[in-house]
């Protein structure tokens, strides 16, 4: 025997209180598949979330994050504060990367500069808060009398951020 509810299309629900007839989803709710016994409440994009797509009777609202925040999680279920390149987010806010560490993203954490000497290379371009060092040829490969213009980067150990 076919379930009488199966004929209720998306955007409606099978109303048990009305002899299982198909009733439209009430305002601020939706059903995305046929045969639903109830409509789901629409997601509300509040606070640091902003509406990317309005809720309709057949599909949920979609949110993203307000400027200055980035999405995490499925369907942008979380928003985390952005920082600038050269910074990382702590509970006290955005803090500059400590010397010897960098972050080239607006999110995430600082990580240590590459230690060129571990690969037998020299530092071609110094690291900054925003950029890793650039390693060049090994000191032995340089022409006689020439030397690396910059001191080697510190060993690639975890940085210690102000917290």
């Amino acid at each position: 025997l076919q379930d009488p509810c199966s004929k209720c299309p998306a955007g409606t629900f099978c109303d048990n209180n009305r002899n299982q007839i198909c009733s439209p989803c009430p305002p601020n709710s939706f059903s995305s598949t046929s045969g639903q016994k109830a409509c789901d409440i629409c997601r509300q994009c509040k606070g640091v979330f902003r509406t990317r797509k309005e809720c309709s009777s057949t599909s949920n609202a979609e949110c993203d994050c307000t400027p200055g925040f980035h999405c995490l999680g499925a369907g942008c279920s979380m928003c985390e504060q952005d920082c600038k390149q050269g910074q990382e987010l702590t509970k006290k806010g955005c803090k500059d990367c400590c010397f010897g560490t960098f972050n080239d993203q607006k999110r995430g954490i600082c990580r240590p500069w590459t230690n060129c000497s571990l690969d037998g290379k020299s530092v071609l371009v110094n690291g900054t808060k925003e950029r890793d060092v650039v390693c060049g040829p090994s000191p032995a490969d340089l022409s006689p009398g020439a030397s690396s213009v910059t001191p080697p980067a510190p060993a690639r150990e975890p940085g210690h951020s102000p917290q």
Epitope: G73, S77, G108, P162
Partner: antibody, heavy 116, light 109 residues
Framework: QVQLVQSGAEVKKPGESLKISCKGS????????ISWVRQMPGKGLEWMGK????????NYSPSFQGQVTISADKSISTAYLQWSSLKASDTAMYYC?????????WGQGTLVTVSS | DIELTQPPSVSVAPGQTARISCSGD??????AHWYQQKPGQAPVVVIY???NRPSGIPERFSGSNSGNTATLTISGTQAEDEADYYC???????????FGGGTKLTVLG
């Protein structure tokens, strides 16, 4: 959509080596940290370490330093966890997760059984 | 490294409030996150950055964090909330993440 797909269950003998994988898709794999988390049978979650696939910088929990190696191949969006010599006490479920503090996506887990 | 301590188990009657604590030296100085894990499943974030609730997580879940204790509160606990709960924090000293030992929440009845 974002997914982390891990390699299948493994049954190994003590002393054998093993490398398990975690393939990311649906996002910029190179620019998000990947962490590995161990869960021994009936026990809690233990953070093992993390890798930044963009430059393969790794950082380990003191408890796991020297016990495992974490690596990544950004060209195929895959992170790895490996052992050179397994012990019975390595029997556990191993999860990869995206992130370093907030783990917003998790793999389905790889069950590793080490038994003679 | 910071150590996070949770009670091994908490029991609550349906509809009542469950509180799960997570204690660690000055944890209030760092963000605390909470994960729910049901049998055979990967963990899921239920609270992030002390008190923020991801969309899709019911409003009955809330969090706080100050001093030496972070707390996950579930108001009007339901049978489906029965699971293991883990707190975690990222510490900038040592560059590491730490999980608490986990708390098994049992919903009575």
């Amino acid at each position: 959509q974002v997914q982390l797909v891990q390699s299948g269950a493994e049954v190994k003998k003590p002393g054998e080596s093993l490398k398990i994988s975690c393939k990311g898709s649906g996002y910029s794999f190179s620019t998000y940290w990947i962490s590995w988390v161990r869960q021994m049978p009936g026990k809690g979650l233990e953070w093992m370490g993390k890798i930044y696939p963009g430059d393969s910088y790794t950082n380990y929990s003191p408890s796991f330093q020297g016990q495992v190696t974490i690596s990544a191949d950004k060209s195929i969006s895959t992170a790895y966890l490996q052992w050179s010599s397994l012990k019975a006490s390595d029997t556990a479920m191993y999860y990869c997760a995206r992130g370093y503090g907030i783990f917003d996506y998790w793999g389905q887990g790889t069950l590793v059984t080490v038994s003679s | 490294d910071i150590e996070l301590t949770q009670p091994p188990s908490v029991s609550v009657a349906p509809g009542q409030t469950a509180r799960i604590s997570c204690s660690g030296d000055n944890i209030g100085d760092q963000y605390a996150h909470w994960y729910q894990q049901k049998p055979g499943q990967a963990p899921v974030v239920v609270i992030y950055q002390d008190k923020n609730r991801p969309s899709g997580i019911p409003e009955r879940f809330s969090g706080s964090n100050s001093g030496n204790t972070a707390t996950l509160t579930i108001s009007g606990t339901q049978a489906e909330d029965e699971a293991d709960y883990y707190c975690s924090t990222y510490t900038f000293v040592g560059f590491t993440t730490v999980f608490g030992g986990g708390t098994k929440l049992t919903v009575l009845g």
